[in-house]
């Protein structure tokens, strides 16, 4: 049976999933899919990691933990009622039928208050990693507005500047999300 998680329309949903790497850096592939875990793989894949990196993701789906340490929890940005349903987290452990499978049921409730487009509530208690400057997902900014047409060099530079800046700490403490992909 699935474990149930809840979020409101317009919020970010957090679907926890973890595994213990056999040794540091000895990562295993992980896939996230919409729909219950099938016998093999994930159906309707929304995000995938390999032994080194996040190698596939779709819009609004990202990892805000450190997947290199075994935190492969999924965040879905700005959810709508259509995001309701079962999600599969599959830890693809080598060997026949060794995979760990987690079916998580996401229930989306209508928003109590219409969220302002450029503001986000403080979800730091709910989300393990609200600020990350590592490449765990697509480029997105929620308090500063979007980052149009920024090339990889600029992103890398911005990431380095943010990492040690007071701005980064202020944003983290306020619960804002800055992700540099």
């Amino acid at each position: 049976s699935e474990v149930e998680y809840r979020a409101e329309v317009g919020q970010n949903a957090y679907l926890p999933c973890f595994y213990t790497p056999a040794a540091p850096g000895n990562l295993v592939p992980v896939c996230w899919g919409k729909g219950a875990c099938p016998v093999f793989e994930c159906g309707n894949v929304v995000l995938r990691t390999d032994e080194r990196d996040v190698n596939y993701w779709t819009s609004r789906y990202w990892l805000n933990g450190d997947f290199r340490k075994g935190d492969v929890s999924l965040t879905i940005e700005n959810v709508t009622l259509a995001d309701s349903g079962i999600y599969c987290c599959r830890i693809q452990i080598p060997g026949i039928m060794n995979d760990e499978k987690f079916n998580l049921k996401l229930v989306i409730k209508p928003a109590k208050v219409t969220p302002a487009p450029t503001r986000q509530r403080d979800f730091t208690a709910a989300f393990p990693r609200m600020l990350t400057t590592r490449g765990h997902g697509p480029a997105e900014t929620q308090t500063l507005g979007s980052l149009p047409d920024i090339n990889l060099t600029q992103i890398s530079t911005l990431a380095n500047e943010l990492r040690d800046s007071r701005l980064a700490n202020d944003l983290r403490d306020s619960g804002a999300t800055i992700r540099i992909g």
Epitope: P16, P24, G65, K69, G70, F127, R134, R172
Partner: antibody, heavy 117, light 107 residues
Framework: EVQLQQSGAELVKPGASVKLSCTAS????????MHWVKQRTEQGLEWIGR????????KYVPKFQGKATITADTSSNTAFLHLTSLTSEDTAVYYC??????????WGQGTTLTVSS | DIQMNQSPSSLSASLGDTVTITCHAS??????LSWYQQKPGNIPKLLIY???NLHTGVPSRFSGSGSGTGFTLTISSLQPEDIATYYC?????????FGGGTKLEIK
């Protein structure tokens, strides 16, 4: 062999600050989250916060924000807990622990902090 | 924050008994729950992770079960060395939280 060696007992005066250390051997702290846990005499375990030594990113229990600062020095494979404006309420044993990734598989021996005038 | 309510807070049992300690989470934590044993004057020691997985070197008389919000630690055939305080801990959401502990004594 994995070990977490913590600094020795501290006796400090109210209002002072203290910095506790936790030096790891047998693994690289960059590969794990490093945590600090408080335990007052005859009381339960209370999570203070953690650091990701790889990039310095921290998480704290709100009540310890401003009281505790967790840092790490990857060159010496050491995590630190800096406590400020000490009061008798801070008298406790402080443990460091590593997580793998969501449970604590190794713990330091604990550092006893006594705040007294 | 997720509250972890552990019961009973203290427990007295005879050698050879089967002992059960429960932990209830204020919201679902799936299987992201661990159990620790702390003997008097000692450091906490991991017993069980992911609700039911026995940590390396832990005797098989310890077992864990549960998912969602309700969890159980069972000690079968209680031994003298099991005198300790036992804690549950959720690792799903920050801030991590511990149960209040269960002090186990021998009758």
């Amino acid at each position: 062999e994995v070990q977490l060696q913590q600094s020795g007992a501290e006796l400090v005066k109210p209002g002072a600050s203290v910095k506790l250390s936790c030096t790891a051997s047998g693994f690289n702290i960059k590969d794990y989250y490093m945590h600090w846990v408080k335990q007052r005499t005859e009381q339960g375990l209370e999570w203070i916060g953690r650091i990701d030594p790889e990039d310095g990113e921290t998480k704290y229990v709100p009540k310890f924000q401003g009281k505790a600062t967790i840092t790490a020095d990857t060159s010496s494979n050491t995590a630190f807990l800096h406590l400020t404006s000490l009061t008798s309420e801070d008298t406790a044993v402080y443990y460091c622990a590593r997580s793998n990734p969501y449970y604590f598989d190794y713990w330091g021996q604990g550092t006893t902090l006594t705040v007294s005038s | 924050d997720i509250q972890m309510n552990q019961s009973p807070s203290s427990l007295s049992a005879s050698l050879g008994d089967t002992v059960t300690i429960t932990c209830h989470a204020s919201q679902t934590i799936n299987v992201w729950l661990s159990w620790y044993q702390q003997k008097p004057g000692n450091i906490p020691k991991l017993l069980i992770y992911k609700a039911s997985n026995l940590h390396t070197g832990v005797p098989s008389r310890f077992s864990g079960s549960g998912s969602g919000t309700g969890f159980t630690l069972t000690i079968s055939s209680l031994q003298p060395e099991d005198i300790a305080t036992y804690y549950c801990q959720q690792g799903q959401n920050y801030p991590y939280t511990f149960g209040g502990g269960t002090k186990l004594e021998i009758k």
